[in-house]
C-alpha cells in the first residue's frame, strides 16, 4: 500500500481557491495524486482529478459558490499503477472564513498638498457578476494604510480607515511617498494580505500658495 | 490647559527594553494627539512617534525601524511608548506632547504642532 500524503490544505484568495499537498516519500516518476471534493450538505465525494502530477490543483471553478454556501472538503490520495493510498482529508472545512483578503489595486495621486488614495477590491475573472467584493462583504470593509517615505525602510505612518478612499495632508512634505494597503472586515477572522507597494513623488510643484 | 508627566526612563542595556508612560491631567486627553519626542546630549528636539485619539493613527521617526511601539489607555489618561532592541544612540531625555486636531498629516512629525509638553524622563542606553 502507498503511503498517504502526509498533509493537505487550501490557499485562496477571493476567488482563487487552490489546493495544496505534500508529496509522499519516495515518490516514483509514475505516482499522482487523485482529487475529490466534498461539498458540505450533499455527502457526497466527486472525484476532481484522477491524476495530478503537480502538488496542487485550482478548485476555483468547482467552489465557486464557496461564498454563499457551508463550505468544502477536500481529499488527495496517491496513485502508482494500480495500487493507491489512503485518502487524506484537509483538517478543516474551507469556508469563507478561510479565504486570504486581497485588494485589486491602489491609486495614488496628489492634490493641493494631500496624498489621495483609491483602494480598488479584488476583481477576479471567475468571479460571478453579482458576487462581487462589496457585495459578500457588505458591511465593516476595514482597511489599514501604511506609509513610508523614500528613502528609508520603515513605515512611519500607519492609519486603519473603514472605507475605500483615503486622504494624507502632507504640511510640506516632499519626497517620494509609498503606500501599502491591507484589507479586513471586522466582524470576520479572515486574514488580510498587504498589498504591494504603490509609490508616488511629491514635489513643491504639488502645493498652492495662499495667503 | 493639560499637564503632562512621564515615567519609566533608567539605565539599560543595549539590545534591552523599557516602557515609557506619560499621564495626563486636566482638559480631556482622549480628543487630542499625542505623541513623543526626544532630545539627545547637545542636538535639538526629534520627532519619535505620535498616536491619534482614537488609536487608529501611528506616526514614526525614521530611526524607530520598527523597534518601538506607541499606545495609549483614554481611560486612565496615558500615553506609553514601548522601546525594544535599545540602541547607545537612543540615549536622551524622551518628553510627551499633546496637539490639537485629527487630520491625518505629517504635521504631527514637527515639534511645532504641540501645545502641551511633559518636563521629561532621561533614558540611557549603556553597558
Known amino acids: 500500500e502507498l503511503p498517504s500524503p502526509p498533509s493537505v490544505w487550501f490557499e485562496a484568495e477571493f476567488f482563487h481557491h487552490i489546493l495544496h499537498w505534500t508529496p509522499i516519500p519516495n515518490q516514483s516518476e509514475s505516482t499522482c495524486y487523485e482529487v475529490a471534493l466534498l461539498r458540505y450538505g450533499t455527502g457526497r465525494w466527486n472525484s476532481i482529478s484522477n491524476c495530478s502530477q503537480a502538488l496542487s490543483y485550482d478548485l476555483t471553478a468547482v467552489t465557486l459558490d464557496l461564498y454563499r454556501s457551508n463550505g468544502y472538503r477536500a481529499r488527495v490520495r496517491a496513485v502508482d499503477g494500480s495500487r493507491h493510498s489512503n485518502w487524506t482529508v484537509t483538517n478543516t472545512r474551507f469556508s469563507l472564513d478561510e479565504v486570504t483578503l486581497t485588494v485589486g489595486s491602489v491609486k495614488l495621486e496628489i492634490h493641493n498638498g494631500f496624498i489621495l488614495g483609491k483602494i480598488q477590491p479584488p476583481r477576479p475573472k471567475m468571479a460571478p457578476a453579482n458576487d462581487t467584493y462589496e457585495s459578500i462583504f457588505s458591511h465593516f470593509r476595514e482597511y489599514e494604510i501604511a506609509i513610508r517615505k523614500v528613502p528609508g525602510n520603515f513605515t512611519f505612518t500607519h492609519k486603519k480607515v473603514k472605507h475605500e478612499n483615503f486622504s494624507l495632508l502632507t504640511s510640506g512634505e516632499v519626497g517620494e511617498f509609498c503606500v501599502q494597503v491591507k484589507p479586513s472586515v471586522t466582524s470576520r477572522t479572515n486574514k488580510g494580505m498587504w498589498s504591494k507597494e504603490e509609490c508616488v513623488s511629491l514635489t513643491r510643484q504639488y502645493f498652492t500658495v495662499t495667503n | 490647559e493639560v499637564q503632562l508627566l512621564e515615567s519609566g526612563g533608567g539605565l539599560v542595556q543595549p539590545g534591552g527594553s523599557l516602557r515609557l508612560s506619560c499621564a495626563a491631567s486636566?482638559?480631556?486627553?482622549?480628543?487630542?494627539?499625542v505623541g513623543w519626542f526626544r532630545q539627545a546630549p547637545g542636538k535639538g528636539r526629534e520627532f519619535v512617534s505620535a498616536?491619534?485619539?482614537?488609536?487608529?493613527?501611528?506616526y514614526f521617526g525614521d530611526f524607530v525601524e520598527g523597534r518601538f511601539t506607541i499606545s495609549r489607555d483614554n481611560s486612565k489618561n496615558t500615553l506609553y511608548l514601548q522601546m525594544n532592541s535599545l540602541r547607545a544612540e537612543d540615549t536622551a531625555v524622551y518628553y510627551c506632547?499633546?496637539?490639537?486636531?485629527?487630520?491625518?498629516?505629517?504635521?504631527?512629525?514637527?515639534?511645532?504642532?504641540?501645545?502641551?509638553w511633559g518636563q521629561g524622563t532621561l533614558v540611557t542606553v549603556s553597558s
Open positions: 498616536i491619534t485619539w482614537n488609536g487608529d493613527t501611528t
Open positions: 506632547a499633546a496637539a490639537t486636531g485629527q487630520v491625518w498629516s505629517l504635521q504631527y512629525l514637527r515639534e511645532s504642532s504641540y501645545a502641551y
Open positions: 486636566g482638559r480631556t486627553f482622549s480628543s487630542h494627539t
